[in-house]
């Protein structure tokens, strides 16, 4: 069964910078990745980025840069301009649409005890549905 993993890390040098890493474990080719925060996309979450391997990438503030790391994983850099970081307690969700499997989504957040530079373990936390 395909799985999605989500990893959130705070940058050691910039406490206001976070990076979300997401990956798809399974066969098939990725057609679209949607990253959202505050919940799954379309279910209370707000879009942060959409990535397509050929058609391009798009991100929305506070996301700074979205890019492919491998053919099945992406990273999203976030910049927190506020004095206190809302990212620390936020859930980030990644939805991978793949052919022929359909859509798979998982969510993750920064562990409460995280030191800068440490990250949440890349454990898939399947939520919602596989369309």
């Amino acid at each position: 069964t395909p799985e999605v993993w989500v990893q959130v890390q705070m940058e050691a040098t910039e406490l206001s910078s976070f990076t979300v890493h997401c990956g798809f474990l399974g066969p098939g080719s990725i057609s679209l990745v949607t990253v959202s925060w505050g919940g799954p996309d379309g279910a209370g979450g707000t879009k942060l980025a959409v990535l397509h391997p050929e058609l391009g990438t798009r991100q929305w503030a506070p996301a700074r840069q979205a890019r492919w790391e491998t053919q099945s994983s992406i990273s999203l850099a976030l910049e927190d301009s506020g004095a206190s970081s809302p990212f620390a307690n936020t859930t980030f969700c990644c939805k991978f649409a793949s052919f022929p499997e359909g859509s798979w989504e998982s969510c993750g957040s920064l562990p409460p005890s995280s030191d800068p530079g440490l990250s949440a373990p890349p454990t898939p936390v399947p939520i919602l549905r596989a369309d």
Partner: antibody
């Protein structure tokens, strides 16, 4: 077949405002963001911004903030752009253009609306 | 914002000739470069995206390539309907930015 039908040409006075429309047909209106692009006479293309018809959320090119306001009417599958405090610099052809995910390629284009600012 | 430097600004060629238009980007946009064609008095139309993928219905005489931050659009064996203006555009985030354009005229 996707089609974008824009409103007709406008001749407006300096300092006035103008609102141009773009009616979409042939596709699901909420599946594509609506972009607006400016083309001054004989010049290149300038992206003004886009709007998500599903929730009305818009993104603007910094240089057009305060100049353009993007709105949509889902019930009629129509997008609007209002331009305010018009000057001769705003005289141009304005295009609406629809883009599907990830909303960075301009897939379908309207025929353009000419706006001339003159006293 | 990502700056797009397109050259040449204008180009005269004859039917049957081969021409190349280039576009240089100020930042790394990976392969996310598109080309649009605009005929006189008409709307622009997507021609090529992701550096070299032809949009639906685009003839194979059009081809795109990349060398570092420089992207090229090549048109082999020019046809009468190919004359007009060409614009490059990155599709790596917003704001979307375009090159200044290349006007391809009949010699």
């Amino acid at each position: 077949e996707a089609q974008l039908q824009q409103s007709g040409p406008e001749l407006v006075k300096p300092g006035a405002s103008v609102k141009i429309s773009c009616k979409a047909s042939g596709y699901t209106f909420t599946d594509y963001y609506m972009n607006w692009v400016k083309q001054s006479h004989g010049k290149s293309l300038d992206w003004i911004g886009d709007i998500n018809p599903d929730n009305g959320g818009s993104t603007y090119n910094q240089k057009f903030k305060g100049k353009a306001t993007l709105t949509v009417d889902k019930s009629s599958s129509t997008a609007y752009m209002e331009l305010r405090s018009l000057t001769s610099e705003d005289s141009a052809v304005y295009y609406c253009s629809a883009s599907g995910p990830p909303y960075v390629l301009l897939d379908y284009w309207g025929q353009g609306t000419s706006v001339i600012v003159s006293s | 914002d990502i700056q797009m430097t397109q050259s040449p600004a204008s180009l005269s060629a004859s039917v049957g000739e081969t021409v190349t238009i280039t576009c240089q980007t100020s930042e790394n946009i990976y392969s996310y470069l598109a080309w649009y064609q605009q005929k006189q008095g008409k709307s622009p139309q997507l021609l090529v995206y992701n550096t070299q993928t032809l949009a639906e219905g685009v003839p194979s005489r059009f081809s795109g390539s990349r060398s570092g931050a420089q992207f090229s659009l090549k048109i082999n064996s020019l046809q009468p309907e190919d004359f007009g203006s060409y614009y490059c555009q990155h599709h790596y985030g917003v704001p979307l930015t375009f090159g200044a354009g290349t006007k391809l005229e009949l010699k």
